[in-house]
Amino acid sequence: GSSPRSGVLLRGCPTHCHCEPDGRMLLRVDCSDLGLSELPSNLSVFTSYLDLSMNNISQLLPNPLPSLR
């Protein structure tokens, strides 16, 4: 479902990643150096920046982030 419009709800931050707001709606997500072997599954559609460096992700499927623009 759609997230209600609110200034007090935190946008989705994947487990163990470090997140910080980017303006009114967006979210910068740092998932670097977490030993991930695949993309985080619960990325917010409001993600403006995603750092997956220093992980063990060997390949990406076509269109791996369909919810992101």
Partner: antibody, heavy 117, light 107 residues
Framework: QVQLVQSGSELKKPGASVKVSCKAS????????MQWVRQAPGQGLEWIGE????????NYNQGFTGRFVLSVDTSVSTAYLQISSLKAEDTAVYYC??????????WGQGTTVTVSS | DIVMTQSPATLSLSPGERATLSCRAS??????LNWYQQKPGQAVRLLIS???RLHSGVPARFSGSGSGTDYTLTISSLEPEDFAVYFC?????????FGGGTKLEIK
């Protein structure tokens, strides 16, 4: 620097109304939501509701609909909380606080509202 | 509404000691947790957002952790100015709800 300055303490009789103001400075008022939270004597924090000053869109806690009304006057960068038909249990400290993407980063100093006959 | 439960209600420690404050949500809040500090006569202060993100100006002795329903605020070595009341708050769903608070007092 960011400042939220609230109006002074109020002593009201049951059934009366009160309007608490929160004057914002040090940032662009319409870029941040304004939250309202109350704290009854010796109690924890309770969310009343929020307003987006850019268009006055509001969300209220279900327990605060009806008697509690949030508003803003962007020309003076001020948010307001009006409570009507005051009851003794409305006695509390009322806080305004600004928020952006989910957390409240600056709070007002609080306004004590006492309801007593 | 999501119920937030903090423990202990009061924690008595000495400066230099490590403080561990707990916050439990009645359902999974997906790391959407903030911590605040309240001192008498002062404005409430944001310490940590998104479970572990330190707000600007907050000393590095404060840290946040946890997942799912269980979260922790840790103060690695208590300073005299840290004795206060601490509240957790979930930002997962409306209405946002706060824990009842933990009072950190000097032993």
């Amino acid at each position: 620097q960011v400042q939220l300055v609230q109006s002074g303490s109020e002593l009201k009789k049951p059934g009366a109304s009160v309007k608490v103001s929160c004057k914002a400075s040090g940032y662009t008022f319409t870029n941040y939501w304004m939250q309202w939270v109350r704290q009854a004597p010796g109690q924890g924090l309770e969310w009343i509701g929020e307003i987006d000053p850019s268009d006055s869109y509001t969300n209220y806690n279900q327990g605060f609909t009806g008697r509690f009304v949030l508003s803003v006057d962007t020309s003076v960068s001020t948010a307001y909380l009006q409570i009507s038909s005051l009851k003794a249990e409305d006695t509390a400290v009322y806080y305004c606080a600004r928020s952006l993407s989910g957390y409240v980063d600056y709070w007002g100093q609080g306004t004590t509202v006492t309801v007593s006959s | 509404d999501i119920v937030m439960t903090q423990s202990p209600a009061t924690l008595s420690l000495s400066p230099g000691e490590r403080a561990t404050l707990s916050c439990r949500a009645s359902q999974d809040i997906s790391n959407r947790l903030n911590w605040y500090q309240q001192k008498p006569g002062q404005a409430v202060r944001l310490l940590i957002s998104y479970r572990s993100r330190l707000h600007s100006g907050v000393p590095a002795r404060f840290s946040g952790s946890g997942s799912g329903t269980d979260y922790t605020l840790t103060i690695s070595s208590l300073e005299p100015e840290d004795f206060a009341v601490y509240f957790c708050q979930q930002g997962n769903s409306l209405p946002p709800t706060f824990g009842g608070g933990t009072k950190l007092e000097i032993k």
